[in-house]
Structure formats: C-alpha cells, structure tokens
C-alpha cells in the first residue's frame, strides 16, 4: 500500500540536492581558502538535520542553528551589498567588485542559492515531489526559514555604509514584503550602520526619471530614518555601463552619470 504523501503547492526539492550542497561546499572552500577549516560533510549533516523528519510547515530558526554555527564567516562589515528583485546584477557587480559581498557570496548563501528543499514529518525521506509554497501553504517552511535566518544574520553583521540594489522596473521598487523589506531593513544595527545607500537600477534605455523620488523609496527612507540610520539614493540609469565602469573606472566615459 503506497504511503499517503502530503501534496504541497510549491515545487519539490531540487534534484541531486544532497550532491549539489556537498559539491558547492567543496567548491566554495576551494575558491575561498580562508574557509578551508569547514568540514563539508558536517555542513551537509547539519543542513539535513534542520529539515529531515520535520513537518515542513513547522521549521524554526532554531532548527538551523547547528548549520549557522558551522557556516560562521566574517565578511568585511562595511562591504555588504543587499539586493531586492535584482539578484543577477548584484552578483555580476560583486564578481567585478571583488571586495564587496552579497549574501550569496558567503558560504551559506552560496550553498542554498536557487535551491528548494523539504522533508516529511517522521520519515528520513527528502520530498522531491512538492514543497510548501510561502503564500499558498505556510511561511515556516524550510527554504523561507533558512533565508530569513541567514538574511537576518547578514544584516546584523553590516556596518558603516550598507548598499542595496533595487529593481527600478518593478511596480514596487521597495517592497515591504521582500526579504530585504521584511527582514534585512529591520535588522540593520543603528549603532553600527551609518547610512543605507540605495542604488535604483533603471530598466529602460530612455528612462531618465528620478526613481529616487518614487513613493516606495520614500517609504524606505522613512523606515530607515526612524531607525536612526541615514538614507541616500542613486539612480543607475545604465546598468550595462555601470558594470563596465566598475571594471574599468579610468575609462573616459565613466565620469558622466551612469
């Protein structure tokens, strides 16, 4: 008799999930020799332990603490780049500007980037068929709780000037319901963070509007100011040119506004 299995609304665990996590950990330690002390098998065991045999709607930040401990990493606190709804450009930027870090440039963010995972209550199986959707099923699912946990820790570690890349093509340039809006903004430490500088990335070639005047940006400014953190905003009219100028800052065309 086949065992009844909960059918969730979201996609199931990414195929080859255990192999991918382990391989990414090994890759990360090869690329970042300062993390060579990390035992990747222990990292996988801790990752697995956070969600295996647990109800996928009943995951807590506590479940991820052993993994957080193993993945403890010091990044320069004044070189943090947050992003919302514009991950690819943020990653392209830190690939060029090597001294800046997104969450996905840290071990834990790198391990989980673009992956989905969940288990089942009382069985050691990974569910490859379906996992809970944040909206339709539950918010305390393994993936959402993981990102909430690592995002909170990442924001708490930030200091001095923190940058955030925002997507100017979205109807809500700043979205209170995004991870940035709901977690990171509220966990920046006013005693450490002096300024949050938003970079609003324009989508259209001919878009010359000042998106820093957008109502959602004003809302972000209000939230940040109330937390005793200064706020500044820049329009990035030409993201392609912006990246090019990060690569070659001495280029003569890079003195004009980008």
């Amino acid at each position: 008799v086949p065992r009844w299995r909960q059918q969730w609304s979201g996609p199931g665990t990414t195929k080859r999930f255990p192999e991918t996590v382990l391989a990414r950990c090994v890759k990360y330690t090869e690329i970042h020799p300062e993390m060579r002390h990390v035992d990747c098998q222990s990292v996988w065991d801790a990752f697995k332990g956070a969600f295996i045999s647990k109800h996928p709607c009943n995951i807590t930040e506590e479940d991820y603490q052993p993994l957080m401990k193993l993945g403890t990493q010091t990044v320069p606190c004044n070189k943090i780049l947050l992003w919302s709804r514009i991950k690819d450009l943020a990653h392209q930027f830190t690939q060029v500007q090597r001294d800046m870090f997104t969450l996905e440039d840290t071990l834990l963010g790198y391990l989980a980037d673009d992956l989905t995972w969940c288990g089942e209550f009382n069985t050691s199986k990974i569910n490859y068929q379906s996992c809970p959707d944040w909206r339709k099923d539950c918010s305390n699912n393994p993936v959402s709780v993981f990102w909430k946990t690592v995002s909170r820790r990442f924001a708490e570690a930030a200091c001095d000037v923190v940058h955030v890349m925002l997507n100017g093509s979205r109807s809500k340039i700043f979205d209170k319901n995004s991870t940035f809006g709901s977690v990171e903004v509220h966990n920046l430490q006013p005693e450490k963070v002096q300024t949050l500088e938003a970079w609003v990335i324009h989508g259209g070639r001919e878009d010359s509007r000042d998106l820093c005047q957008d109502p959602t940006i004003k809302e972000l400014e209000s939230i940040i100011s109330k937390r005793n953190i200064q706020f500044s905003c820049k329009n990035i009219y030409r993201p392609d040119k912006f990246l090019q100028c990060v690569k070659n800052p001495e280029d003569s065309s890079c003195t004009s506004e980008i």
Epitope: R16, E19, T20, A23, R24, V26, K27, E30, I31, P33, R36, H91, Q95
Partner: antibody, heavy 120, light 107 residues
Framework: EVQLVQSGAEVKKPGATVKISCKVS????????MNWVQQGPGKGLEWMGW????????DVAEKFQGRVTITADTSTDTAYMELSSLRSEDTAVYYC?????????????WGQGTTVTVSS | DIQMTQSPSSLSASVGDRVTITCKAS??????VDWYQQKPGKAPKLLIY???NRYTGVPSRFSGSGSGTDFTFTISSLQPEDIATYYC?????????FGGGTKVEIK
C-alpha cells in the same frame, strides 16, 4: 571515469586570439571548479585561473588579467580559455585541471594539454 | 604571491637509491602542498596531496612530509619508471603557485 578532453594544437600569429576547449565527462560539470595551467617549453607550471561553471564566476592570476577570459557552457559540459593579444612567450602547453573529493585541493584530473604556438 | 622554492633543480641517482626533494614556501601554507610527477609530453600526475597523503593508486615508495614553510618529497627506492620532473604546488592561497621543478635522472 572522469575525463577532461581538450581541443587540438593551434598555431597563431602574434596579436591574434586563441580559444581552447576542455570537454568533461564522468561527473557533473557544475559540481567542480575548473582550473587552467600554462607550461612554457622546457619551463615549469603556472596557474592561470579558474571558473565555477555553475555560476560563471572566475578568477584570473594577475599576470594574465586583461588577456585571459575563462568561460563555461553547461549545455555541452565544456570549459573554455581564451587568450588574446598573443605574443611569442605565450607559446606553451595549456592544461585544464580540477580537484577531486579525495585529494585535498590538489589536481588529480588533467586534460591531455593543448599546444599553442605563436609565430609570425 | 607565495613563492615556492624547489631544490635541487635536477639530480641523478641510481636505481634503488633514496631520493629527496625539498620545497620552501615564502610564507606559511599550513599543510596545503601537493606533489606532482610529469613525464615528457604528458600532463602532470598527482602523487601527494596535503603534504603527506598519497593519492589513490600511488606506490608506497612515494611520500611527503612537512608543514608551514618547509616540505619534503621522498622516493624511498628509485625505480626506472620514476624518471620524470617533479613539482610541488601550494594550494593554500590564490594564486596557486608551483615550484620550479626537479628533473630526476638515472645514473
């Protein structure tokens, strides 16, 4: 069985560009970083850079920056190393190489090498 | 960059002899040193990883030791098939760097 198979020998003129390929089999391409190593005639080995095929992230040794581009095509499980503005001292054998799970951070897996000759 | 100074650059020994090659790193590399054997026209072959671990299938006559800045590679009893050039490589920091190589010949 892990295999790294490189493209054939190339003869190029000074100032030209060469692009060498390294096609892998026997493992999941995105699971490992791919490195490139240069060996001049009668000379030692020099690490050039790496690519993480999963994300396209690269790192190139300072000596080669600006002239070396490392790319990967995950649809064909192939890594590429492009060297531009060729000069006579770029005449060398170029290898792709990767680490293994039971080899620390050494390179147990190597391509057979691609000989590039730069001559006018 | 970390310099790896390998010595000697060449040596000649008899079959059955004990052969020792040294590598000195310009700064601490922990135990992240690997040793390779390369025969003419062939790709290098990993013999020793992390200073002292023999890679799978490597004969027991090959060994390595050391940590920090000083490393030693030993062939306990030289065989005719061991004629090759041997390289050390530090894998502790980027860029990875190799020693200049030691060419081993039979007397």
């Amino acid at each position: 069985e892990v295999q790294l198979v490189q493209s054939g020998a190339e003869v190029k003129k000074p100032g030209a560009t060469v692009k060498i390929s390294c096609k892998v089999s026997g493992y999941t391409f995105t699971d490992s970083v791919m490195n490139w190593v240069q060996q001049g005639p009668g000379k030692g080995l020099e690490w050039m850079g790496w690519i993480d095929p999963e994300y396209g992230r690269t790192d190139v040794a300072e000596k080669f920056q600006g002239r070396v581009t490392i790319t990967a095509d995950t649809s064909t499980d192939t890594a590429y190393m492009e060297l531009s503005s060729l000069r006579s001292e770029d005449t060398a054998v170029y290898y792709c190489a990767r680490t293994g799970y039971q080899s620390g951070y050494g390179f147990p897996y190597w391509g057979q090498g691609t000989t590039v000759t730069v001559s006018s | 960059d970390i310099q790896m100074t390998q010595s000697p650059s060449s040596l000649s020994a008899s079959v059955g002899d004990r052969v020792t090659i040294t590598c000195k790193a310009s700064q601490n590399v922990d135990s992240d040193v690997d040793w390779y054997q390369q025969k003419p026209g062939k790709a290098p072959k990993l013999l020793i990883y992390k200073a002292s671990n023999r890679y799978t299938g490597v004969p027991s006559r090959f060994s390595g030791s050391g940590s920090g800045t000083d490393f030693t590679f030993t062939i306990s009893s030289l065989q005719p098939e061991d004629i090759a050039t041997y390289y050390c490589m530090q894998s502790n920091t980027h860029p990875r760097t190799f020693g200049g190589g030691t060419k081993v010949e039979i007397k």
